[in-house]
């Protein structure tokens, strides 16, 4: 049994890091493998992650972490029974993938303005809380070419757009994702999408 593709990990910089790797053949990850991880810190304790299958030869493990900060560094040991298959390390702050925003809502009752709001996925005491920026994707269910991205570079989790910038009388969907420049993160996954019917009164022409 050998590791074909070494584990790569990303952290949500809050409580979970996800590691993925590939074995050289079909593997029952949860029965055959264990990923041991330990913070390189005084008094830290070793933890064991039981991986799940991710395709035939792929495995994924969700590592639970407390109080993640930029100084943290973890040792990782991948075991198959008594055999050490791979040894490495992981610094969560250098591989951050933010959590996806939630509770995306479209408010259509504001005079000819669409107000989109969503929730910041981090608590106020987490460093990323004040450092997320967002991308909002709006697209038409009827017209695949009607697809747009709005970059929200301010901290407030909301976006206002004129309803007239979208076609009237058709349904649209929106979703939002986040990233943080401070840690050079990847983009989060998209939030679940939300749907609304765009209707506004065309201005009366003389």
């Amino acid at each position: 049994m050998k590791v074909l593709q070494e584990p790569t990990c990303v952290s949500d910089y809050m409580s979970i890091s996800t590691c993925e790797w590939k074995m050289n053949g079909p593997t029952n990850c949860s029965t055959e493998l264990r990923l041991l991880y330990q913070l390189v810190f005084l008094l830290s304790e070793a933890h064991t992650c039981i991986p799940e299958n991710n395709g035939g030869a792929g495995c994924v493990c969700h590592l639970l972490m407390d109080d993640v900060v930029s100084a943290d560094n973890y040792t990782l040991d991948l075991w198959a029974g008594q055999q050490l298959l791979w040894k490495g390390s992981f610094k969560p702050s250098e591989h951050v993938k933010p959590r996806a925003p939630g509770n995306l809502t479209v408010h259509t009752n504001v005079s000819d303005t669409l107000l989109l709001t969503w929730s910041n996925p981090y608590p106020p005491d987490n460093y990323l809380y004040n450092h997320l920026t967002y991308a909002v994707n709006i697209w038409s269910e009827n017209d695949p070419a009607d697809f747009r991205i709005y970059n929200v570079t301010y901290l407030e989790p909301s976006l206002r757009i004129a309803a007239s910038t979208l076609k009237s009388g058709i349904s649209y969907r929106a979703r939002v994702r986040a990233w943080a420049q401070c840690y050079n993160t990847t983009w989060s996954e998209w939030s679940p999408s939300t749907k609304w019917h765009n209707s506004y009164r065309e201005p009366f022409e003389q």
Partner: antibody
């Protein structure tokens, strides 16, 4: 919000021991390390040691080795710092502080006076 | 005896900028991250800066931190009378056993 509530002031005689408590609330108690530091009157801060509330393991500053004991009670989310063989130089305000590499939150402090 | 050295006192007028230095060594500041604490008279210390330069929520951006080699600096701009306090740097040292030294402390007086 996070709160670290410390026990009240103590007056002790030289040679005695003192046990200071620090009750934590507003966060997952076993997820954060706890430090103890002290400050003698008119002096600076001095680190004493650290405890991992999850397993109860401890590490102490070399200066206090053999005299200090840190424990925790997960059922009440409380950590304790006991200092023995007290001398007049141990007169200080003793603080508990939550954190790992740095101290996010501090208790208000407990004044321990050692006097004959 | 602290292994982190700070000036005993600094002073400046309201609205001015002041800096406080913290000098250490390769086994502490040089190999770790620096935090700064503010201690107002008669109160417990409060975290001001961590990770060399990050502010906890609620700390105004008038406070900033930096690190270079084995030294660190706290800068306070737009000084206010309420900033009058003792300031301590902190880090961790892994030279023999892990320890968390604090700086000697700096008394800031707002003139």
């Amino acid at each position: 919000q996070v709160q670290l509530v410390q026990s009240g002031a103590e007056v002790k005689k030289p040679g005695a021991s003192v046990k200071v408590s620090c009750k934590a609330s507003g966060y997952a108690f076993t997820s954060y390390y706890m430090h103890w530091a002290r400050q003698a009157p008119g002096q600076g801060l001095e680190w004493m040691g650290i405890i991992n509330p999850s397993g109860g393991s401890t590490s102490y500053a070399q200066k206090f080795q053999g005299r200090v004991t840190m424990t925790r009670d997960t059922s009440t989310s409380t950590v304790y710092m006991e200092l023995s063989s007290l001398r007049s130089e141990d007169t200080a305000v003793y603080y508990c502080a939550r954190g790992k590499y740095w101290m996010y939150d501090w208790g208000k402090g407990t004044l321990v006076t050692v006097s004959s | 005896q602290s292994v982190l050295t700070q000036p005993p006192s600094v002073s400046a007028a309201p609205g001015q900028k002041v800096t406080i230095s913290c000098s250490g060594g390769s086994s502490n500041i040089g190999n770790s991250y620096v935090s700064w604490y503010q201690q107002l008279p008669g109160t417990a210390p409060k975290l001001l800066i961590y990770d060399n330069n990050k502010r906890p929520s609620g700390i105004p951006d008038r406070f900033s931190g930096s690190k270079s080699g084995t030294s660190a600096t706290l800068a306070i701009t737009g000084l206010q009378t309420g900033d009058e306090a003792d300031y301590y740097c902190g880090t961790w040292d892994t030279s023999t056993v892990w320890e968390w030294p604090f700086g000697t402390g700096t008394k800031l007086t707002v003139l």
